[in-house]
């Protein structure tokens, strides 16, 4: 029986151009975590295998940094990064647990203000 639960940061927001840490935590189970997959809708961002290390999808390699821990750091955020992110925990013997995080990337008011008064 799967007894575990995934705790996530839930709904989070960050400024355009900034970075954010996506973090999940599996609790209430003694199952061994073999791998964590990070996905955004239908896209694979990264895989962290407990023994084999990290795989970063090439389309994200310049903007994704592994860690901290089993988490994932998204950098140079754009408004297009707004959306659902999933942490998929592969465990033994329980099977798969999935957590959801919703990220909203906001236009930076500072950046907008700076752009409006930029000296040519």
């Amino acid at each position: 029986m799967m007894t575990g639960t995934i705790e996530t940061t839930g709904n989070i927001s960050a400024e355009k151009g900034g970075s954010i840490i996506l973090q999940c935590h599996l609790s209430s189970t003694t199952a061994q975590v073999t791998q964590v997959n990070w996905e955004q809708q239908d896209q694979l961002l990264a895989i962290c295998n407990a023994d084999l290390g990290w795989h970063i999808s090439p389309s994200f390699k310049d903007r994704v940094a592994p860690g901290p821990g089993l988490g994932l750091t998204l950098q140079s955020l754009t408004v297009n990064d707004t959306g659902e992110y999933f942490c998929i925990y592969h465990t033994y013997p329980d099977g798969t647990y999935t957590g959801r995080i919703f990220l909203e990337v906001l236009e930076s008011s500072v950046a907008e203000h700076g752009a409006r008064f930029q000296i040519p």
Partner: antibody, heavy 119, light 107 residues
Framework: QVQLVQSGAEVKKPGASVKVSCKAS????????MHWVRQAPGQRLEWIGG????????SYSQKFQGRATLTVDTSASTAYMELSSLRSEDTAVYYC????????????WGQGTTVTVSS | DIQMTQSPSSLSASVGDRVTITCKAS??????LAWYQQKPGKAPKLLIY???YRYTGVPSRFSGSGSGTDFTFTISSLQPEDIATYYC?????????FGGGTKLEIK
């Protein structure tokens, strides 16, 4: 340039063990995970497992768990795969292969070691 | 375990032909898929990684596409040196698995 050079062909009796070596050069062995893949005559490639030389973590296919042992001697830049309790179905070419930096595809391969199990 | 089914298992084509090989995964593997070329008596060589990225030094006639469970490998204009067996490989989850291979021959 990156090179993976494997030990020579082996002929073993059923029930025996074999240890295949893989000498890495042209890169730092601790920077890439090393995997072992085998290919029986006329068969598909089969992943045995992988070892992360940086932290010593190993991952095995369930099929080989308990029978295969992957190790790395970082000072000698050499990876090893030992397979015990050999049977005729283990007759195959065994390859060491490394995964790319921060990727899981297998970008460099050894030349292969033929292991024949026969009574 | 994730099963990888390649088709066809063998095919014969002429020099200059467009050749397409498909690989179907038994479950979603996103884009965690690579393609390899293996010539007789030699080790496999990486051609395509992450479903659609051509590996360094691989000629542009080789390409890959797909995501999820269905993947395609294409040689846009077959050359004599392309005679080999081609394998797909999923690394979405362990144990990593390979397709049964497609043996390519020249007509």
């Amino acid at each position: 340039q990156v090179q993976l050079v494997q030990s020579g062909a082996e002929v073993k009796k059923p029930g025996a063990s074999v240890k295949v070596s893989c000498k890495a050069s042209g890169y730092t062995i601790t920077e890439n995970t090393m995997h072992w893949v085998r290919q029986a005559p006329g068969q598909r490639l089969e992943w045995i497992g992988g070892i992360n030389p940086n932290q010593g973590g190993t991952s095995y296919s369930q099929k080989f768990q308990g029978r295969a042992t992957l190790t790395v001697d970082t000072s000698a830049s050499t990876a090893y795969m030992e397979l015990s309790s050999l049977r005729s179905e283990d007759t195959a070419v065994y390859y060491c292969t490394r995964s790319s930096y921060y990727r899981y595809d297998l970008d460099y391969w050894g030349q292969g070691t033929t292991v024949t199990v026969s009574s | 375990d994730i099963q990888m089914t390649q088709s066809p298992s063998s095919l014969s084509a002429s020099v200059g032909d467009r050749v397409t090989i498909t690989c179907k995964a038994s479950q979603d593997v996103k884009t965690a898929l690579a393609w390899y070329q293996q010539k007789p008596g030699k080790a496999p060589k990486l051609l395509i990684y992450s479903a659609s990225y051509r590996y360094t030094g691989v000629p542009s006639r080789f390409s890959g596409s797909g995501s999820g469970t269905d993947f395609t490998f294409t040689i846009s204009s077959l050359q004599p040196e392309d005679i080999a067996t081609y394998y797909c490989h999923q690394h979405y989850t362990t144990p990593w698995t390979f397709g049964g291979g497609t043996k390519l021959e020249i007509k």
